[in-house]
């Protein structure tokens, strides 16, 4: 492409940055940007705090968190002071009727009697056929099975107590969790007399018990963590060291590593081409054609026709060709990308504190999520609890005259009903009163608050890191010119001047994300609808919004870098970043892909390394480590391995996100540097010598021959 043509393209995306003699990296004298948005954000946060206070004043999360018996009395309080645990007579009815929405709104409520108990049942037990005619006292009270509802007479027949659901028909060994007795052991329960296989209890017992192993799985897991937590921490430490090591060693091995990786990709594609050719050849000789197959929704059937392999071969061949052409014609761009990666590695080495900034982001994100969760919980429980009449078997004799779902007083249970098992149970929270009527709107406000604050925290992290790394790039004499506390000064600067700009960027992203959530919700509701046009439109919408979100994230990221450097408002920064990148689009694409490839490999290395080490250690395959390094005896050795792998992935992601931000910042600075400076004495390049060398440029030496330190 000719130089003139390139100039025309560049003009379309604005003029190159002019030289500014006062520019010395991130501007010191700044003013607040996007003040309106800052005020709006602060007002929103203030409103969010007010919502939180209102929720705290009106809500009672005890209603969700603390267990309550069928009468609505809290376990472990008042009359139930010595009975802190809640026992569900038939916990399987909870399993069958519980979903995330009902739990969020109503807590762990189940359509089964619930009683406060001093301790959870320890042994499996079922009412025997011969016990139905005995008294409650004989079957329950004398056997220390004090699990009936309060006030059940000693001399009541067991069968009638079961019909009225005053006593449980079976007990499972349970362990208290969240103040509730949850079954934990696999036991072979005797058959429940009179209960056919298609009843809830029989289904529930067989279903749940079959899914539980010989001993309490949760206890086994807990034991495994108790035995291996130290070694899991060691594995995470290894992941941390490997991530750091990888980033710091990039300055030495970035070139060969990128080359090896690209050649590796080429090799994999070449093997793919070979494999597809072999498959195609075999099927072509057999004469297996798609015309014989016809149309089928069975995708695996397409593996046995030659056209499938031919199509795959063509796609892989095209990819291979593109990659080869890129390697041949864009090698200069690849060399620049490698040099920038090395520079980023140096920057991280100079400012190690940046590697641990993700911890700050993590804590702030945790605060945002916790605040939202607590507010949502308090809001959900801000109404007066409402109770309605409910019976497990409304077809029982005597139930036909009972108005099921009419409101009732839980303290005045229908103990003398003609309908067996009639109870006054918790239904939900009333919507009377201003707060309760506005509940939905307040929850929406909370969700908006969650998204906006989360995105703002992430934006803050990006802007702070950009400020720190920009101060590294624009330090003429490295490391002397780098500020003493680059990260802290960037943090203070960002918070002080650019809260509004970050809020603006975060709000744009939030609106797109909310739109995506709404679309997902609509899609979920339309799952049953088989209209292909509707499905197609929905799919297109979702795809468009996904692309839009990706683009906005990319734009925001670069806008924040510009904000960190120049201190301009969001729109100006986003425009400048976008035009600068568009003027250098080929470099952008190459750097982006090379960085992605490298960071993907880095993650693979860290996660794979930790995974392999964990596997060999926890499965006891490493011999002769000595007593101090002996692997613990575990029930499930894969558990600490998976934990280590997931932890390693989180750690690697945290470190590499910093490194990615560093690369992006240095790249933008590099592009600015190229446009702003020309290597003359009054306009020297700030980039490293290796970058200058690749570009075939150099800085003029000062008359006193004092060389610039790099």
């Amino acid at each position: 492409m000719g130089g003139k043509q390139r100039d025309k393209d560049d003009e379309a995306y604005g003029k190159p940055v002019k030289y500014d003699p006062s520019f010395r990296g991130p501007i010191k004298n700044r003013s607040c940007t996007d003040v309106i948005c800052c005020v709006l954000f602060l007002l929103f946060i203030l409103g969010y705090i007010v919502v939180g206070i209102v929720a705290w004043l009106y809500g009672d999360p005890r209603q969700v968190l603390y267990p309550r018996n069928s009468t609505g009395a809290y376990c472990g309080m008042g009359e139930n002071k010595d009975k802190p645990y809640l026992l569900y007579f038939n916990i399987f009815s909870c399993i069958l009727s519980t979903n995330i929405i009902s739990v969020a709104e109503n807590g762990l409520q189940c359509p089964t009697p619930q009683v406060c108990v001093s301790s959870c049942p320890e042994d499996p037990w079922t009412v025997g056929k011969n016990q139905f005619s005995q008294t409650v006292g004989e079957v329950f009270y004398t056997k220390n099975r004090n699990f009936c509802l309060p006030g059940v007479p000693w001399n009541m027949m067991v069968i009638t107590s079961l019909q009225q659901e005053l006593c449980p028909s079976f007990l499972l060994p349970s362990a208290p969790a969240l103040g509730r007795c949850f079954p934990w052991t696999n036991v072979t329960l005797p058959e429940l007399p009179g209960i056919t296989n298609d009843t809830t209890i029989a289904q529930g017992i067989s279903g749940l018990i079959d899914s539980l192993n010989a001993r309490d799985i949760s206890v086994k897991i807990f034991e495994d963590f108790a035995h291996s937590w130290y070694w899991i921490l060691v594995a995470l430490g290894v992941a941390l060291l490997l991530s750091l090591l990888f980033i710091l060693l990039l300055r030495l091995v970035a070139g060969p590593l990128v080359l090896v990786l690209i050649l590796g990709v080429l090799g994999v594609l070449a093997y793919g081409i070979y494999y597809c050719w072999e498959e195609y050849r075999v099927l072509r000789d057999k004469g297996a054609s798609i015309s014989q197959l016809g149309f089928t929704t069975n995708l695996s059937a397409y593996q046995s026709v030659q056209e499938t392999w031919l199509a795959a071969l063509i796609v892989l061949a095209v990819l291979e060709a593109i990659l080869l052409l890129v390697l041949i014609f864009l090698r200069q761009r690849i060399r620049i990308a490698i040099a920038l990666l090395k520079e980023a590695s140096k920057a991280v080495g100079q400012m190690m504190s940046t590697m641990f900034y993700p911890l700050v982001t993590f804590v702030l994100l945790l605060i945002c999520i916790a605040y939202w969760a607590m507010t949502a919980l308090y809001l959900a429980t801000s109404g007066q609890p409402q109770y309605v009449l409910w019976a497990s078997n409304i077809s029982s004799p005597g139930c036909e005259k009972v108005s099921i779902n009419t409101s009732c007083n839980p303290m005045d249970q229908p103990v003398n009903s003609s309908c067996p098992g009639l109870m006054c149970v918790f239904q939900g929270y009333s919507s009377k009163g201003l707060v309760q009527r506005s509940l939905f709107n307040l929850q929406i406000y909370g969700v908006l608050g969650l998204f906006w604050t989360l995105n703002w925290v992430l934006a803050l992290g990006q802007c702070v890191l950009a400020g720190a790394f920009a101060s590294f790039y624009w330090a003429f004499h490295k490391p002397q010119d780098i500020p003493t506390f680059p990260l802290i000064s960037a943090f203070i600067r960002t918070l002080r001047y650019h809260t509004g700009s970050l809020a603006f960027g975060a709000l744009i992203l939030t609106l797109v994300q909310i739109a995506r959530v709404i679309l997902e919700y609509i899609d979920h509701k339309l799952r049953g609808v088989q209209n292909p046009v509707a499905r197609c439109i929905m799919c297109c919408f979702k795809c468009c919004l996904w692309c839009l979100e990706k683009f906005i994230k990319f734009l925001n990221r670069n806008a924040y870098i510009m904000i960190a450097i120049y201190g301009k408002n969001f729109c100006v920064s986003a425009k400048n970043a976008f035009t600068l990148l568009m003027r250098n689009i080929v470099r952008v694409v190459v750097l982006d892909k090379v960085t992605d490839l490298l960071l993907f490999f880095g993650k693979l290395l860290v996660v794979g390394g930790v995974g392999v080490l964990s596997f060999f250690f926890f499965s006891g395959r490493i011999q002769g480590l000595g007593r101090d390094f002996k692997s613990p005896h575990l029930n499930y050795y894969w558990l600490p391995i998976m934990t280590s792998i997931m932890g390693a992935y989180v750690i690697a992601s945290g470190f590499f996100s910093v490194f990615g931000m560093c690369v992006d910042t240095l790249f933008l600075c590099f592009l600015e540097d190229l446009e702003r400076n020309d290597g003359s004495l009054d306009r020297p390049y700030y980039m490293s010598k290796s970058l200058l060398k690749i570009l075939g440029k150099k800085n003029e030496a000062p008359p006193d021959n004092k060389k610039r330190k790099k």
């Epitope: 001399n155 009541m156 009638t160 007399p193």
Partner: antibody, heavy 125, light 107 residues
Framework: QVQLVESGGGVVQPGRSLRLSCAAS????????MHWVRQAPGKGLEWVAV????????YYTDSVKGRFTISRDNSKNTLYLQMNSLRAEDTAVYYC??????????????????WGQGTTVTVSS | DIQMTQSPSSLSASVGDRVTITCRAS??????LAWFQQKPGKAPRSLIY???SLHSGVPSKFSGSGSGTDFTLTISSLQPEDFATYYC?????????FGPGTKVDIK
Amino acid sequence: QVQLVESGGGVVQPGRSLRLSCAASGFTFSSYGMHWVRQAPGKGLEWVAVIWYDGSNKYYTDSVKGRFTISRDNSKNTLYLQMNSLRAEDTAVYYCARDRYSGYDYFYYYGMDVWGQGTTVTVSS
Amino acid sequence: DIQMTQSPSSLSASVGDRVTITCRASQGIYNYLAWFQQKPGKAPRSLIYAASSLHSGVPSKFSGSGSGTDFTLTISSLQPEDFATYYCQQYTIYPFTFGPGTKVDIK
């Protein structure tokens, strides 16, 4: 058809014993609970005792506890009431009655459904 | 023990009358209440179980209602064969107990 026939009644002196029998027919005796109910002359009905289908569970009214014993022989389809230390207030017509609960139906309990014609016990010196 | 009381203890009615007998338990017995009919010199006959369900062969003129502690037996149209003594019985708490009975005779 379902039938219950009581026997063994008669005149007996206070402090003596008597054994009442109830022969069942027309149903699977071993699957049902059985009751004894009495009625003193000119008075109302009084529940005396129950024995459940397998004979394992027996319950009595307080006034006869320790003196009367309810039992059954499922092989002979017969229900018994052994009455010891009889008192004048035990004078009554004794009825046996079948309980509708068979031990198989978990969800419903109906109480007594079929009655015998009764046998008279007179305790007199 | 649970005490069962019936009211009235006796009543006089004419053929075709609607008769209502009430039974009260000293504590809640849910719906575990039965009604029996006994004619002089005869064995009792089961009419109603579970407070309101009719035994097989019992005419629909008999109906029962109530739960907890208060129950009623209603004969919608009294016939000559219905003149007898009626007993209620609770069968949920041992010992099972009968009411004292309500005698229905011809006016």
